[in-house]
């Protein structure tokens, strides 16, 4: 953390003071933003955004869909964030099934996790079909799975996000990749 000289505005403080928080489904989410110039809380996940003008964000009974990034902003435009995972064994993925890629570019399969501690977060072909051998990915539990350098041959590829939960493979809803040619 860079030191802030006196008189220079500083970002807000959030309690609990950690970058990630894991709560169980049904439990309370209670986030406190401490700043004399508090303006708002913003919640973001996938394409959803919500705002709250109270300095304490309370969700009494957390659901999987409360998983996301909570950002507190002050009057100087400075902000601080905490990412909350709401662990729900019945809903391991949040999904936005739109999946478009441009040839030779990366594209994001939007299936963020509600539990960051599951293992083997990866992609699987639909109905047990193999994925292309040259497909490569980078996982991000908060955003989804980035497919690297999409090939034209991937057009109409059907896939699922996949994790292992207690020794069993769990699949997300299916995604169909649409690829736009580079030229």
């Amino acid at each position: 953390q860079p030191s802030v000289s006196p008189g220079e505005p500083s970002p807000p403080s959030i309690h609990p003071g950690k970058s990630d928080l894991i709560v169980r489904v049904g439990d309370e989410i209670r986030l406190l933003c401490t700043d004399p110039g508090f303006v708002k809380w913003t919640f973001e996940i996938l394409d959803e955004t919500n705002e709250n003008k109270q300095n304490e964000w309370i969700t009494e009974k957390a659901e999987a869909t409360n998983t996301g990034k909570y950002t507190c902003t002050n009057k100087h435009g400075l902000s601080n964030s905490i990412y909350v995972f709401v662990r729900d064994p019945a809903k391991l993925f949040l999904v936005d099934r739109s999946l478009y890629g441009k040839e030779d570019n990366d594209t994001l399969v939007r299936c963020p996790l509600t539990d960051p501690e599951v293992t083997n977060y990866s992609l699987k072909g639909c109905q047990g079909k193999p994925l292309p051998k040259d497909l490569r990915f980078i996982p991000d539990p908060k955003a989804g799975i980035m497919i690297k350098s999409v090939k034209r041959a991937y057009h109409r590829l059907c896939l699922h996000c996949s994790v292992d939960q207690e020794g069993k493979s769990v699949l997300s809803e299916k995604f169909i990749l649409k690829v736009r040619p580079a030229f």
Partner: nanobody, 125 residues
Amino acid sequence: EVQLVESGGGLVRAGGSLRLSCAASGRTFTYDARAWFRQAPGKEREFVAAISWSGGSTYYPNSMKGRFTISRDNAKNTVYLQMNSLKPEDTAVYYCAADESFPAYYSDYALYRYWGQGTLVTVSS
């Protein structure tokens, strides 16, 4: 290019534990996929565990889950493999691998580009 150096191997009694380290140097910031494989004499190289450098997602075959744990220390640019309840059949040379991203078939050793020299683990009965 990335250089990988494994350490921590040695002789251990069955039921014991070891922690292997894989220190990376070079252009490591571009290499998100880090993995451990092992090769016993006369056998094919076998997937043990993997971790995503940026997001911390972990990968294991079912056979290794519970006994082996992969972790990372970003400040030291090092990946660890904690091995517990070791058995004589865990005897092998353990290799660290890296690549910019994970192959769809992340347990396939042929799909990783960068490798360390390996460290020998011997488990006696």
